[in-house]
């Protein structure tokens, strides 16, 4: 019997009856065995078929068989009720081999031309199964040339049998106080050949309670106890189960904080499995009673291990543990049934004694020394010398523990010095310098630093002076010795101030005229304002109306007197403002260079002379009374004049302060 080609030779070819396309002879028997590679099958179809027709193809036939199974017995030219001819049919081997047998009997009634067939090996698609047959793979089947392989969904692993998907269902640990666990895929059928281990592990002190819920369906056996699939529950005390069948097991109170649940399945069956809802219990803690002015949250019927509650105080009350304030309070129930922290108190918020107000005082409104929530205090500034800046001074103790103003400010109000107060009555004579009396010029500042000069106090930590008076000290501000609060130049009873910084107007050029002869000294500490130390006011926009020609200004200082010595006592002189053109003209003749008097200057003095400021007065203020506010303001700064002070036809020249208000305000606000 001729053999077909053997793998690995190419598996395809042609078969034909002996003598084809001629008629075949009698008593012929021919057999072909075709073999394909593993995972392949053989496909065969006929291009010509002409055999003697006989009942059940008993005479002449072609028989196709694969292994022990006969695929077809063929004869005739066309199929009848009892005989089959191939027609256009394609035949497939069941495995990788196909046997073809041709036989003719001893006679033919007429000549028959036989058959011609073609074959080829083709891949078997193992993944396609006939309806009703078990699938090739549990989950995913992947066909390839010569074979197939199975794979599993996430959470499963391929069993050793290469077809079944076992669930990866071990190592799950449940640590919450309650929860649910179930067989894989529940309520769909659970997987085969799986071994699942679940752990419930709670903190010591808890006891786990298991409830089987919804449905229970685990493969069972009528005689033997759970031989196929089973569920077991293990604690450190005892084992429960095995469980199988269709009846929900009863509640299990484990009296243990750790439980291991084991579920094992075999290779067969189609059951939905189980679902467990677990809870836990523990020894309850005493019911928490909220302190007065506080409340407990959350409110529960009982509190067991790990349960917690917080205490929240009413507005205006704060948590206190003993004497210590707490930001928050939470207590946790312990395994022995006690709370881990003692109950705090809700104590009324105490803002504490209010801060002292510099140059002011505080008064308790609610009651003497009452500083608790909603208490009211009233700040006020020291009368006469200080006034409160944009604040009514009323503060309330708020829930956050801070004294808070009606505008919501937590910072102290500011007591600003009152400016321009003087004990001096106006209308003094303008003839002759006079001795100042206490409180007449409380803004007067004596500046020592190489030479004697003067200045005027602004606010409580600035001194306004002439640039030329402090130019040498601009880089060594601390060398300036600043004295105030005294009338006597040589008295030890002065208030000492020291300079932190000197600001000379950027437009001032030393030894090149006196334009922009203005400077500010910042003091390193605020001075205390009193009747002898009071700042001068800066001119208002409307101040020009009090500084017209012939209006009287007052200059004060310890400068040279007619006797040619520095004055021991503070002196002052009332002098009228001189017409600007008249003053300009007075200083246009030699030895004065043209343009000595600028628009940034004002002149004051008598045409007849005799009344003037002099060396040592430099930097001091030429002041005017604002009759609307009844406050004194600085209109000029003693700057320069004729070589001989008080000379007739010459005038004292002063820096015009109103031209420098923006400069002054900028420096003071920036520093």
């Amino acid at each position: 019997t001729p053999l077909g080609p053997k793998w690995p030779e190419p598996v395809f070819g042609r078969l034909a009856s002996p003598g084809f396309p001629g008629e075949y002879a009698n008593d012929q028997e021919r057999r072909w065995t075709l073999t394909a590679p593993p995972g392949y099958r053989l496909r065969l179809y006929f291009t010509h078929f002409d055999l003697e027709l006989s009942h059940l193809c008993e005479y002449d036939f072609v028989k196709l068989s694969s292994g022990a199974k006969v695929l077809a017995t063929l004869c005739g030219q066309e199929s009848t009720d009892t005989e089959r001819a191939p027609g256009k049919d394609t035949f497939y081997s069941l495995g990788s081999s196909l046997d073809i047998t041709f036989r003719s009997d001893y006679s033919n009634e007429k000549p028959f031309t036989g058959f011609e067939a073609f074959y080829a090996a083709e891949d078997i698609d193992e993944c396609q199964v006939a309806p009703g047959e078990a699938p090739t793979c549990d989950h995913h089947c992947h066909n390839h040339l010569g074979g197939f392989y199975c794979s599993c969904r996430a959470g499963y692993v391929l069993h050793r049998n290469k077809r079944t998907c076992s669930a990866l269902c071990s190592g799950q640990v449940f640590t919450q106080r309650s929860g649910e666990l179930s067989s894989p895929e529940y309520p769909r059928p659970y997987p085969k050949l799986s071994s699942c281990t679940y752990s419930i592990s709670l903190e010591e002190g808890f006891s786990v309670i298991l409830d089987f819920v919804e449905s229970f369906d685990v493969e069972t056996h009528p005689e033997t106890l759970c031989p196929y699939d089973f569920l077991k529950i293990q604690t450190d005390r005892e084992e429960h189960g095995p469980f199988c069948g269709k009846t929900l097991p009863h509640r299990i109170e484990t009296k243990s904080n750790t439980v291991t649940i084991t579920f094992v399945t075999d290779e067969s069956g189609d059951h939905t499995g189980w679902k467990i809802h677990y809870t836990s219990t523990a020894q309850p803690c005493p019911y928490p009673m909220a302190p007065p002015n506080g409340h407990v949250s959350p409110v529960q019927a009982k509190y067991i291990l790990k349960d917690s509650f917080s205490i929240f105080c009413e507005t205006g009350y704060e948590l206190l543990q003993g004497h210590l304030p707490l930001k928050s309070f939470t207590a946790v129930c312990q395994k022995d049934g006690s709370w881990d922290r003692p109950m705090p108190a809700c104590s009324i918020v105490d803002c504490g004694p209010p801060d002292d107000l510099p140059s002011g005082r505080v008064e308790y409104i609610t009651g003497p020394g009452v500083t608790t929530y909603k208490a009211v205090i009233q700040y006020s500034c020291e009368e006469t010398f200080y006034t409160m800046k944009v604040n009514d001074g009323k503060y309330v103790c708020e829930a956050d523990g801070f004294w808070t103003s009606s505008k919501g400010e937590k910072s102290l109000p500011v007591c600003e010095p009152v400016c321009g107060l003087s004990a001096r009555t106006t209308g003094g004579r303008i003839y002759g310098g006079q001795k100042a009396k206490p409180g007449d010029f409380p803004w007067q500042v004596l500046i020592l630093g190489g030479t004697t000069a003067a200045g005027a106090l602004l606010y409580d930590n600035w001194v306004l002076t002439a640039a030329h008076a402090v130019y040498e000290q601009k880089h060594d501000a601390s060398a300036l010795d600043i004295r105030m609060g005294t009338l006597k130049r040589l008295s030890p009873h002065y208030t000492q101030a020291w300079s932190e910084a000197v600001f000379i107007h950027e437009g001032y050029t030393h030894d090149a005229g006196f334009d922009n002869d203005i400077a500010l000294i910042k003091l390193n500490n605020k001075v205390v304002i009193n009747s002898n130390i009071t700042p001068i006011c800066l001119p208002r926009k409307e101040a020009e109306s009090f500084m017209r020609t012939d209006d009287i200004g007052t200059a004060s200082g310890w400068g040279l007197t007619q006797r040619g010595f520095l004055a021991r006592n503070l002196m002052y002189v009332d002098i009228p403002i001189v017409d600007h053109q008249k003053c300009t003209a007075a200083y246009e003749k030699p030895p004065y260079p043209r343009g000595s008097v600028t628009a940034n200057m004002l002149c004051a003095g008598l045409e007849s002379g005799g009344k003037d400021s002099c060396r040592g007065d430099s930097g001091g203020a030429l002041v005017f009374l604002d009759s609307e506010t009844e406050r004194w303001f600085v209109g000029g700064i003693v700057s320069w004049g004729s070589m001989n002070c008080g000379e007739a036809g010459q005038y004292g020249v002063y820096t015009k302060v109103i031209n420098y208000i923006p400069w002054i305000e900028n420096i003071i606000s920036d520093f």
């Epitope: 010795d481 006597k488 040589l490 008295s491 030890p492 002065y494 000492q496 020291w498 021991r568």
Partner: antibody, heavy 121, light 106 residues
Framework: QVQLQQPGAELVRPGSSVRLSCKAS????????MHWLKQRPIQGLEWIGD????????HYIEKFKDKATLTIDKSSSTAYMHLSSLTSEDSAIYYC??????????????WGTGTTVTVSS | QIVLTQSPVIMSASPGEKVTMTCSAS?????MYWYQQKPGSSPRLLIY???NLASGVPVRFSGSGSGTSNSLTISRMEAEDAATYYC?????????FGAGTKLELK
């Protein structure tokens, strides 16, 4: 040269008063403040107060306000300190000292010879 | 008021030896003044404005310091320097003195 002359000692009865003198020479008396100080072995040096001889302006520390009174006699260039209601606590050496006028004005460039006051019955 | 604490309370030095004594203030002072007082005599100004030597004072005396810490130094001790030394301030009212440092000759 500049000198401040004080009597050497004064013995006084408790409850009485005493006037201590300090005669200045060698400088213009009215140009310098005059200060008075008390020295006892345990308490050390204490400042009492001062006076401006040009116009008799005075200053006292709180402790001595009711105890001491400072005065001036310009014609003799003499400064005086009157101590009243004397007790044993007032027994001490009392110095007059001239205040500096060159720098801070707050120290003593010349000291008197000192008067030892003993209060005893 | 500002309290001035002098240290040491008592010290001794040999002729030619360098001597330093300190004066510590309870608050910052701008200037310190030093006086020398010998037994039976009145105090005498040594140093003014922290570091300036008073008229007639030997150059072996010097003063230094700032804020709350000041010192008086004698570069080479001489027999005539045996005395009690006082520091004084008037940066803050009232004027106060230290309790003194007694310097003895070894």
């Amino acid at each position: 040269q500049v000198q401040l002359q004080q009597p050497g000692a004064e013995l006084v009865r408790p409850g009485s008063s005493v006037r201590l003198s300090c005669k200045a020479s060698g400088y213009t008396f009215t140009n310098y403040w005059m200060h008075w100080l008390k020295q006892r072995p345990i308490q050390g040096l204490e400042w009492i107060g001062d006076i401006d001889p040009s116009d008799s302006e005075t200053h006292y520390i709180e402790k001595f306000k009711d105890k001491a009174t400072l005065t001036i006699d310009k014609s003799s260039s003499t400064a005086y300190m009157h101590l009243s209601s004397l007790t044993s606590e007032d027994s001490a050496i009392y110095y007059c000292a001239r205040g500096d006028i060159t720098t801070t004005l707050r120290y003593f460039d010349v000291w008197g010879t000192g008067t030892t006051v003993t209060v005893s019955s | 008021q500002i309290v001035l604490t002098q240290s040491p309370v008592i010290m001794s030095a040999s002729p030619g030896e360098k001597v330093t004594m300190t004066c510590s203030a309870s608050s910052s002072v701008r200037y310190m003044y030093w006086y020398q007082q010998k037994p039976g005599s009145s105090p005498r100004l040594l140093i003014y404005d922290t570091s300036n030597l008073a008229s007639g004072v030997p150059v072996r005396f010097s003063g230094s310091g700032s804020g709350t810490s000041n010192s008086l130094t004698i570069s080479r001790m001489e027999a005539e320097d045996a005395a009690t030394y006082y520091c004084q301030q008037w940066s803050s009212y009232p004027l106060t003195f230290g309790a003194g440092t007694k310097l003895e000759l070894k």
